[in-house]
């Protein structure tokens, strides 16, 4: 069958995100990757951007993040857009309203992003086939 | 709601100055980029100049580097800039933008006639 | 600089047409691309950003397309409200902005 349009927009947005590496790449987040066993495709989608929401919500308008150069501030803006449409579509995917999070392990948002990578080509791979 | 209101209509003689300013409401100055662009009778746009109040950066249009002067009064919320060495061909509505590469809110415009 | 070209410069379309229009990147800019309309006598308005994003209360009949050089604005279903000049412009060599140079969209 074929796969949902707001899943190649995602993969196209994560391929956006994981180019480049901003100030605050590097800060942590929740890592709901890490004990996922139990977990079903819509609660990962939906906990995913329930961090990612979390991390623009805190960081949009911190000031070690926007930098100190015109550059910075536009790769750290471009970030939190990409982030907030990568949250939109992810809670399109989950269809839930709200899930928990309550994981003690952090990994940095760039590792977060390539492994939410990974699991939306193995996902693209599966129903494009 | 986020809002820039500018300064009023301005008619100069040549060879003076004028000074526009930009206030802005909301957030605009905390994590935005200003930016200033401008529209010659019947024409398209050009891009002068932006400051980021944040960080306190400034950049310039090489055209119009030596003669426009962006500056930002964070405890107003207030954006400035200032044309030096005005000529007829600077007849113009002159915008101020808030940006982060892309203009999401504009203020009204404000037209600046120079005319002997 | 980047040098970006609107084509065409003008058109006449009447209500319910779908519109086209193109601007045409000097150089790759990726999706740093945005498009505004303006109707006389006022300020522009952001319709799309990052190429292909919606502005929020932009109509759903508004769309952007492209990367790298060549990108699109189509207008689904022309509305009488849509007759207006469109502009795009980049930043991808964040700071500096250009602009294309305007197509006006005009009652057939």
């Known amino acids: 069958h074929k796969c949902d349009i707001t899943l190649q927009e995602i993969i196209k947005t994560l391929n956006s995100l994981t180019e480049q590496k901003t100030l605050c790449t590097e800060l942590t987040v929740t890592d709901i990757f890490a004990a996922s066993k139990n977990t079903t495709e819509k609660e990962t989608f939906c906990r995913a951007a329930t961090v990612l929401r979390q991390f623009y919500s805190h960081h949009e308008k911190d000031t070690r993040c926007l930098g100190a150069t015109a550059q910075q501030f536009h790769r750290h803006k471009q970030l939190i857009r990409f982030l907030k449409r990568l949250d939109r579509n992810l809670w399109g995917l989950a269809g839930l309203n709200s899930c928990p999070v309550k994981e003690a392990n952090q990994s940095t948002l760039e590792n977060f992003l390539e492994r939410l990578k990974t699991i939306m080509r193995e996902k693209y791979s599966k129903c494009s086939s | 709601q986020v809002q820039l209101v500018q300064s009023g209509a301005e008619v100069k003689k040549p060879g003076s100055s004028v000074k526009v300013s930009c206030k802005a409401s909301?957030?605009?100055?905390?994590?935005?980029?200003i930016s200033w662009v401008r529209q010659a009778p019947g024409q398209g746009f050009e891009w002068m100049g932006g400051?980021?109040?944040?960080?306190?950066?400034?950049n310039y249009e090489e055209r119009f580097q030596d003669r426009v002067t962006i500056t930002a009064d964070n405890s107003t919320s207030t954006a400035y800039m200032e044309l030096t060495s005005l000529r007829s061909e600077d007849t113009a509505v002159y915008f101020c933008?808030?940006?982060?590469?892309?203009?999401?809110?504009w203020g009204q415009g404000t037209l600046v006639t120079v005319s002997s | 600089a980047i040098q970006l070209t609107q084509s065409p410069s003008s058109l006449s379309a009447s209500v319910g047409d779908r519109v086209t229009i193109t601007c045409r990147a000097s150089?790759?800019?990726?999706?740093?691309l945005a498009w505004y309309q303006q109707k006389p006598g006022k300020a522009p308005k952001l319709l799309i950003y990052?190429?292909?994003s919606l502005e929020s209360g932009v109509p759903s009949r508004f769309s952007g397309s492209g990367s790298g050089t060549d990108f699109t604005l189509t207008i689904s279903s022309l509305q009488p409200e849509d007759f207006a000049t469109y502009y795009c412009?980049?930043?991808?060599?964040?700071?500096?902005?250009?602009f294309g140079g305007g197509t006006k969209v005009e009652i057939k």
């Open positions: 150089q790759g800019i990726s999706s740093a």
């Open positions: 400051i980021i109040p944040v960080i306190g950066t400034v």
């Open positions: 412009q980049q930043f991808n060599s964040y700071p500096l902005l250009t």
């Open positions: 990052d190429a292909s």
């Open positions: 909301g957030d605009t100055f905390s994590s935005y980029a």
């Open positions: 933008g808030r940006e982060e590469g892309f203009l999401d809110y």
